[in-house]
């Protein structure tokens, strides 16, 4: 009998955003969730292959917190926080899930100031990153995944194109933060955005708490 399993996508580390492998073995112990074992800073982490000692593949676990301390850049003017996952390679769907696991969403850009701030953070990088733009629900046309109004546009010329196969948006450093549409299933780095909520409590990603366990009739949960 097994619990329904949701991938927990890692942050930073050396696994390019791959999800935790649960359970995993570290220092001759088996871990059935994220752990801070072996870290002085207390950050939760997991292995992304079953045997950490053999492969040494790992990443930090996503946490829903009410601040922007770890892994986030904060715009002091707007209080919005941004996380650039340059080393990750996830599909748009996986990137969205990774942001959601941190109480965030994929990046939406709703004004020129925000675009300028993002461009500043992208300076020095050469990358194409997923943002929240998508037209996956074609009844609504292009929209932001966090439901922000699409009132500011920065499409590159001749974009968006190929409506049948390129339904998710990217931001590109090569065009000074211009937007393109791409095939949602390709693997790319991504940007998350959140507004810190003073009422939110930090919660580790315990994807197995309060989950109804479904077993065959002869099995016990």
């Amino acid at each position: 009998c097994a619990l329904p399993y949701h991938e927990v996508y890692t942050i930073q580390g050396n696994s390019h955003g791959k999800p935790c492998t649960i359970p995993f073995k570290y220092d001759n112990q088996w871990f059935h969730g994220c752990t801070s074992t072996g870290r002085e800073d207390g950050h939760l982490w997991c292995a992304t292959t079953q045997d950490y000692g053999k492969d040494e593949r790992w990443g930090f676990c996503p946490i829903k917190s009410n601040d922007c301390e770890t892994f986030w850049d904060k715009d002091q003017l707007t209080d919005s926080c941004y996380q650039f996952n340059f080393q990750s390679t996830l599909s748009w769907r996986e990137a969205w899930a990774s942001c959601e696991q941190q109480g965030a969403d994929l990046l939406s850009i709703t004004e020129i100031h925000e675009q300028t701030y993002i461009n500043g953070l992208l300076t020095g990088y050469s990358s194409t990153l997923w943002i929240g733009l998508n037209d996956l629900d074609t009844s609504g046309g292009w929209q932001w995944s966090d439901n922000s109004p699409l009132k500011y546009l920065n499409w590159e010329s001749d974009q968006p194109d190929n409506p049948s196969e390129e339904n998710c948006g990217v931001i590109r450093t090569e065009s000074s933060g211009g937007w393109q549409n791409r095939d949602c299933s390709i693997a790319l780095p991504y940007v998350c955005k959140k507004k810190p909520n003073a009422t939110a409590e930090p919660t580790p990603p315990d994807r197995w708490a309060n989950v109804k366990v479904e077993c065959e009739p002869s099995w016990q949960p």
């Epitope: 074609t138 049948s164 196969e165 949602c184 299933s185």
Partner: antibody, heavy 117, light 108 residues
Framework: EVQLVESGGGLVKPGGSLRLSCAAS????????MNWVRQAPGKGLEWVAN????????HSVDSVKGRFTISRDNSKNSLYLQMNSLRAEDTAVYYC??????????WGQGTLVTVSS | SSELTQDPAVSVALGQTVRITCQGD??????ASWYQQKPGQAPVLVVY???NRPSGIPDRFSGSSSGNTASLTITGAQAEDEADYYC???????????FGGGTKVTVL
């Protein structure tokens, strides 16, 4: 209203050839990639081939490579599938399908290809 | 063999709920869509994206997903829901559309 109408199916002997056509209307044909999907009698759906909006890139399932060629004529709003060296296992209903965002949202009614001696 | 795996057949009593599942690696990367096909007819899209329905599809059809598994649920199955159901997702550039083998739903 989006419409896709296939034609060109029929009975053909093994090793023979057929050319299927799909007439599209109700949308800007030249903006969309297009696909052929087939269904053998009593079996499931199998993607066969697709072509980019400008015809610059084509892909097909391994089992038809070198035998089937997908093409399009944007001036005629038409999609084609040239089928050569046909085999009994190619017997199927062939559907023309237009993709939307991550899905195949419009299908034709299908045309039956029967390969038999 | 299909890149997506479905149970071949399920049955449901009239008015009851049935869930059809679809498993495959491409479902981690892409959202599933579901098609209904009745004998002699072309497939019809019933659910797509997270849990969206094209116009004209009754709200008793709903979709969900977790990890590499997608589900189609018919809540309060009707006689006209008896059909084959196929899952589908974006695949790779070499094989851009992955299909499940289909599930035959019988309404008793």
């Amino acid at each position: 209203e989006v419409q896709l109408v296939e034609s060109g199916g029929g009975l053909v002997k093994p090793g023979g050839s057929l050319r299927l056509s799909c007439a599209a209307s109700g949308f800007t044909f030249s903006s969309y990639s297009m696909n052929w999907v087939r269904q053998a009698p009593g079996k499931g759906l199998e993607w066969v081939a697709n072509i980019k909006p400008d015809g610059s890139e084509r892909h097909s399932v391994d089992s038809v490579k070198g035998r089937f060629t997908i093409s399009r004529d944007n001036s005629k709003n038409s999609l084609y599938l040239q089928m050569n060296s046909l085999r009994a296992e190619d017997t199927a209903v062939y559907y023309c399908a237009r993709p939307g965002a991550g899905r195949l949202d419009y299908w034709g009614q299908g045309t039956l290809v029967t390969v038999s001696s | 063999s299909s890149e997506l795996t479905q149970d071949p057949a399920v049955s449901v009593a009239l008015g009851q709920t049935v869930r059809i599942t679809c498993q495959g690696d491409s479902l981690r990367r892409s959202y599933a869509s579901w098609y209904q096909q009745k004998p002699g007819q072309a497939p019809v899209l019933v659910v797509y994206f997270k849990n969206n329905r094209p116009s004209g599809i009754p709200d008793r059809f709903s979709g969900s997903s977790s990890g590499n598994t997608a589900s189609l649920t018919i809540t309060g199955a009707q006689a006209e829901d008896e059909a084959d159901y196929y899952c589908n997702s974006r695949g790779t550039s070499r094989n851009p559309w992955a299909f499940g083998g289909g599930t035959k739903v019988t309404v008793l």
